[in-house]
């Protein structure tokens, strides 16, 4: 009898830890995904930025996955997204082709199923770099809650590539999972 | 037989309760910390932030220690870290020696393991304000999601500290955790 | 024996499954709310924003409740609050009143039973929009960790509100539960 | 090397005007906070002007607040002070300072010129 | 307007000595004080800022220290080149104000 109760008893504890290892949300999925500046593109206009480490210094990334330049989401739930984007210039690399800047940032969502992109996230401002100061910084942060599903990707747009802070401090992007999707 | 049964799901139930409680991350760790204006230092170069309060108005901490100006980490796991740092200055705040002002903020981690201290995050902009206006203002955010280590602290750098808004919505630090490591 | 030492697993199994559910902590509660660009006020000094969206778009709300213009807390617990706020203003909308702009942001808790507000964050930045560029923008980002009580309500003002940029990815604010009040 | 050169000091009669000039080299003078400061004979030092690093901003003690005008041009890396209404108190060696590098609100000197003469007297 | 109380007014001292000027201010200004030295017919010079920081290329032997209201300025050796007037200047709140001045003789 006691050993059956003990047999009953390991399969409640067994079945528990399962649950309770599953209520850690599975390994709650995050990314922290930090500029690659060996390959920024140029120009002015909205740009993709495709080139991200995952897994150096800061970036790092768990039960997401990261190709072509987005963030895959590999698990449904509700994240909180964030980035924070750097632009500097300094008078020595050179003139600006202009000195009213539009510095801009956009997160968007894209769906693979539906094949359609939409911007969750976005932020910036209009600056004025004039010629008076050697040197010119501007940052952006953005975050927000969402409801992402499983296949879906994150990307970040911005404008004046050429400008971003190269460092992994400056410009990242990245996203955890806060709970499940009733 | 139905005594020893009552006792085996009291062992259950009570190992349970443990992991339940266990399983709400041990009293999940989390600091907001708002400046303490009375101790302000002065300075235009990167200053550290040591002056915080962690038990009145909105400033509260748990599971984390604040300590000799620094934040301390007492369990490890994966944290989000934010800041929010107002500058402002108004005419009769004093007399202000230059209108091209770079405000920044540099959120750091320092090891005391290995001593060395690496930022984390930084924001800023660099501001033209005019003595055709009578009152400048300007806020900094940032955040993200990091790994910290029991012992590891985190401190606040900025620029230009005698500029900065002394209330506690508008100057703040804070982490709460998110997840263990795996 | 063997029927009543079943009957007592569904007991532990049944109660361990309520209490893996709370655990879920009762469904977090959260919110993201979209600014309803068909109802912004005018004038140029700060007010109360109370138009959101709460159930299009990436709107969405959840174990909260939208009212009156307030986000109401339905569940004791800590929140990570957050605001983003964009402002824009192109030259076909007519001249600006004035080219020295505040730009502000404040996120308040209203407790109803002390009846008080209090701002919780606050950012923003003085401008200096010329007539020299066509178009001017600028965005503000806050966010931060509160202990909020069921009944309290969470709003947003806002300077300059005929300046706000109306899409959802552009001004919004939201919170989400990231843990019980010990 | 950084300099500072005063000039346009001289003789003038109470009631009258003068304009100092302070010329600077050797240094990005569109940088620096600028001053003037005096010293009368056989005295201490008094502070009597301020101008921001871009000009917009301009101090003045009681003393002279209305009579004396700081201004600079970037342009040529100078300082000048307008003095009008003189008074035999305002006779003194003016000398030209650079404000050095620190705290936005906190003025201290690194940089001084040699200072010019100005001696108010009918 | 803050007041800058220095003494003493002059001393006379021998070189290798140990020579203490102090400034009162007449209220707080926490570490916000300069000192200058001027040799006579000169303009006056740097030495120490923020109460105990030495300008650049100033001697070792000239130092400062205090803060709130009471601040010292040493020169730890006195050398014959020392012969000047020293002023104190509090950089805390316009206007900014000087002391007296402490002229410092070789006996």
């Known amino acids: 009898g006691s050993q059956h109760i003990r047999a009953e008893k390991a399969m409640v504890d067994g079945s528990w830890l399962d649950l309770a290892k599953r209520s850690k949300l599975e390994a709650q999925p995050f990314a922290h995904l930090t500029i690659n500046a060996t390959d920024i593109p140029t120009g002015s206009h909205k740009v993709s930025l495709s080139s991200w480490y995952h897994d150096r210094g800061w970036a790092k990334i768990s039960n997401m996955t990261f190709s072509n330049g987005k963030l895959i989401v590999n698990q449904d739930g509700f994240y909180y997204l964030y980035a924070n984007i750097c632009f500097r210039h300094h008078e020595t690399s050179g003139d600006l082709a202009t000195e009213y800047l539009q510095l801009m940032v956009y997160v968007t969502k894209t769906s693979i199923k539906i094949p359609s992109s939409h911007t969750l996230m976005k932020g910036g401002s209009t600056k004025y770099w004039s010629g008076n100061s050697e040197f010119h910084f501007y940052s952006i942060n953005v975050g927000g809650f969402f409801k992402l599903r499983s296949g879906e990707e994150i990307s970040v747009e911005v404008s004046n590539p050429s400008l971003l802070d190269p460092d992994q401090d400056a410009t990242y992007f990245g996203a955890f999972k806060v709970r499940d999707i009733d | 037989g139905s005594q020893h049964i009552r006792a085996e799901k009291a062992m259950v139930d009570g190992s349970w309760l443990d992991l339940a409680k266990r399983s709400k991350l041990e009293a999940q760790p989390f600091a907001h910390l708002t400046i303490n204006a009375t101790d302000i230092p002065t300075g235009s170069h990167k200053v550290s932030l040591s002056s915080w309060y962690h038990d009145r108005g909105w400033a509260k901490i748990s599971n984390m220690t604040f300590s000799n100006g620094k934040l301390i980490v007492n369990q490890d796991g994966f944290y989000y870290l934010y800041a929010n740092i107002c500058f402002r200055h108004h005419e009769t705040s004093g007399d202000l020696a230059t209108e091209y002002l770079q405000l920044m903020v540099y959120v750091t981690k320092t090891s005391i393991k290995i001593p060395s201290s690496h930022t984390l995050m930084k924001g800023g902009s660099t501001k033209y304000w005019s003595g055709n206006s009578e009152f400048h203002f300007y806020s900094i955010n940032v955040g993200g999601f990091f790994k910290l280590r029991s012992g590891e602290e985190i401190s606040v750098e900025v620029s230009n500290p005698s500029l900065l808004d002394p209330d506690q919505d508008a100057t703040y630090f804070g982490a709460f955790k998110v997840r263990d490591i795996d | 024996g063997s029927q009543h030492i079943r009957a007592e697993k569904a007991m532990v199994d049944g109660s361990w499954l309520d209490l893996a559910k709370r655990s879920k902590l009762e469904a977090q509660p959260f919110a993201h709310l979209t600014i309803n660009a068909t109802d912004i006020p005018t004038g140029s000094h700060k007010v109360s924003l109370s138009s959101w969206y709460h159930d299009r778009g990436w709107a969405k709300i959840s174990n909260m409740t939208f009212s009156n213009g307030k986000l109401i807390v339905n569940q004791d617990g800590f929140y990570y609050l957050y605001a983003n706020i964009c402002f824009r203003h192109h030259e076909t909308s007519g001249d600006l009143a004035t080219e020295y702009l505040q730009l502000m942001v404040y996120v308040t808790k209203t407790s109803i039973k002390i009846p008080s507000s209090h701002t919780l964050m606050k950012g923003g930045s003085t401008k200096y929009w010329s007539g020299n560029s066509e178009f001017h923008f600028y965005s503000i980002n806050v966010g931060g960790f509160f202990k909020l009580r069921s009944g309290e309500e969470i709003s947003v003002e806002v300077s300059n509100p005929s300046l706000l940029d109306p899409d959802q990815d552009a001004t919004y604010f939201g919170a989400f539960k990231v843990r019980d009040i010990d | 090397e950084v300099q500072l050169v005063e000039s346009g000091g001289g003789l003038v009669k109470p009631g009258g005007s003068l304009r100092l000039s302070c010329a600077a080299s050797?240094?990005?003078?569109?940088?620096?906070?600028m001053s003037w400061v005096r010293q009368a004979p056989g005295k201490g030092l008094e502070w009597v002007s301020g101008?921001?690093?871009?000009?917009?901003?301009?101090y003045y003690p009681d003393t002279v607040k209305g009579r004396f005008t700081i201004s600079r041009d970037n342009a040529k890396n100078s300082l000048y002070l307008q003095m009008n209404s003189l008074r035999a108190e305002d006779t003194a060696v003016y000398y030209c300072?650079?404000?050095?590098?620190?705290?936005?609100?906190?003025?201290?000197?690194?940089?001084w010129g040699k200072g010019t003469t100005v001696t108010v007297s009918s | 307007d803050i007041q800058m109380t220095q003494s003493p007014s002059s001393l006379s001292a021998s070189v290798g000595d140990r020579v203490t000027i102090t400034c009162k201010a007449s209220q707080d200004v926490r570490t916000s004080i300069a000192w200058y030295q001027q040799k006579p017919g000169k303009s006056p010079k740097l030495l120490i800022y923020s109460a105990s920081y030495r300008y650049t290329g100033v001697p070792s032997r000239f130092s400062g220290s205090g803060s709130g209201t009471d601040f010292t300025f040493t020169i730890s050796s006195l050398q014959p080149e020392d012969l000047a007037t020293y002023y104190c200047?509090?950089?805390?709140?316009?206007?900014?104000?000087f002391g007296g001045g402490t002229k410092v003789e070789i006996k």
């Open positions: 050797g240094f990005t003078f569109r940088n620096y906070a």
């Open positions: 300072a650079r404000r050095d590098y620190g705290d936005v609100y906190e003025w201290y000197f690194d940089v």
């Open positions: 101008i921001s690093s871009g000009g917009t901003y301009t």
């Open positions: 200047q509090q950089h805390y709140s316009s206007p900014w104000t």
